[in-house]
Interface confidence: low
Amino acid sequence: EVEKTACPSGKKAREIDESLIFYKKWELEACVDAALLATQMDRVNAIPFTYEQLDVLKHKLDELYPQGYPESVIQHLGYLFLKMSPEDIRKWNVTSLETLKALLEVNKGHEMSPQVATLIDRFVKGRGQLDKDTLDTLTAFYPGYLCSLSPEELSSVPPSSIWAVRPQDLDTCDPRQLDVLYPKARLAFQNMNGSEYFVKIQSFLGGAPTEDLKALSQQNVSMDLATFMKLRTDAVLPLTVAEVQKLLGPHVEGLKAEERHRPVRDWILRQRQDDLDTLGLGLQG
């Protein structure tokens, strides 16, 4: 907490400029008007303030806006954003995607911090749903963002937003998250032709039910083993040997290498040995 002291004669700041880096903390507190700071926030990032000086500037804004900063200030916080606590951010009402992008840029290259997570949460809640533009932005900064959401939160993602999802965005999703995302993807891509559809839906198939896998097996999709191994065990179990053979196409030979792993192991155990023998892979049920 900086002591309240009078501003020395001639030191009253008329604008936010580089001369302020020579001010001691108490001088910044006494000589910089909070309202001036708020209107010239865009200049702060161009000035090499120390962390201690930034603390003073934050303190001044906190005093000016005890109920939370207005978006006009938030958009220009820049590196001062790194000084904010999740509690500070919970007071904000961020509605502009440009503001979100500006603050995410400050944290770029780093893990998602509690501050960023709170900011995103406030933004998405303010919008009411995770629209395509927001999802595009968030996954660009944080490829794992989608998989950081709970299944309940994912349920608010509209199918139209699924077009923004890239395969790498789903890398860390757990099975229950894919259970929620898959039906949305199926709806989003429903008007695509067979081969294009499979390319798009492939990343989401960890949430696919048996009947959809059976349908895919009739379309010569040649699913790779990596995708097959991510399928739900309970969805794979009812598939016949012929259906798995059609689903995998030339990749069916890879079953041998995966015979001790789920879901292949569980599937093999439920097949008749004479059916397995038709594959010529030496699989033992």
Epitope: S148, E152, T172, C173, D174, P175, R232, T233, R262
Partner: antibody, heavy 119, light 107 residues
Framework: QVQLQESGPGLVKPSETLSLTCTVS??????????WSWIRQPPGKGLEWIGY???????NYNPSLKSRVTISVDTSKNQFSLKLSSVTAADTAVYYC???????????WGQGTMVTVSS | DIQMTQSPSSLSASVGDRVTITCRAS??????LNWYQQKPGKAPKLLIY???SLQSGVPSRFSGSGSGTDFTLTISSLQPEDFATYYC?????????FGGGTKVEIK
């Protein structure tokens, strides 16, 4: 085969934080197929799911406990952990760690550890 | 949250009896229903997953059936080691929830 072992203090004071660790042996906490859960059972009562974590660090908590729970994973030690803050006597229970397989069932459980909240 | 209601809460039976325990979900959970057996001082043990699939190593006298909201666990011929408490659990959506349990006692 995969085995789970809980460890941590058996006595925690009210308002403090309960911390437990589950060590996975004979398998990997980094398995893409599995979710790692904490479940508790107060004396003489039924089972309550606390939350789970995926190898990637993605978590899902029971809303009734969400504000007090943190589950984390340490893939280098093949462990996952539970922290429950601001405990009261109502948090006295046997705490189990369990593996939820791809079939959606808890197929492997630790033996459980009794945690008593008392001053 | 999905509520799981088990009935009866307890029952008395003799060795060799056929025992049926029911579990009802407050909304449809497809086939995402598991059954566990718990003995005093021990961790629960998985018996049935996905409503009707028998877990490896579990005796075939245990069977499960049902889909949607109504499920049944059947023990075709009760054995001395089967006296325990049985729990159902849904894995359809989070929070994952358990039934209140059914205690099977010796008559």
């Amino acid at each position: 085969q995969v085995q789970l072992q809980e460890s941590g203090p058996g006595l925690v004071k009210p308002s403090e934080t309960l911390s437990l660790t589950c060590t996975v042996s004979g398998g990997s906490v980094s398995s893409r197929d599995d979710l790692w859960s904490w479940i508790r059972q107060p004396p003489g009562k039924g089972l309550e799911w606390i939350g789970y974590i995926y190898y990637s660090g993605s978590t899902n908590y029971n809303p009734s406990l969400k504000s007090r729970v943190t589950i984390s994973v340490d893939t280098s030690k093949n462990q996952f952990s539970l922290k429950l803050s601001s405990v009261t006597a109502a948090d006295t229970a046997v705490y189990y760690c369990a593996r939820e397989g791809k079939n959606g069932a808890f197929d492997i459980w630790g033996q459980g550890t009794m945690v008593t909240v008392s001053s | 949250d999905i509520q799981m209601t088990q009935s009866p809460s307890s029952l008395s039976a003799s060795v060799g009896d056929r025992v049926t325990i029911t579990c009802r979900a407050s909304q449809s959970i497809s086939s995402y229903l598991n059954w566990y057996q718990q003995k005093p001082g021990k961790a629960p043990k998985l018996l049935i997953y996905a409503a009707s699939s028998l877990q490896s190593g579990v005796p075939s006298r245990f069977s499960g059936s049902g889909s949607g909201t109504d499920f049944t666990l059947t023990i075709s011929s009760l054995q001395p080691e089967d006296f325990a408490t049985y729990y159902c659990q849904q894995s359809y959506s989070t929070p994952l929830t358990f039934g209140g349990g059914t205690k099977v006692e010796i008559k």
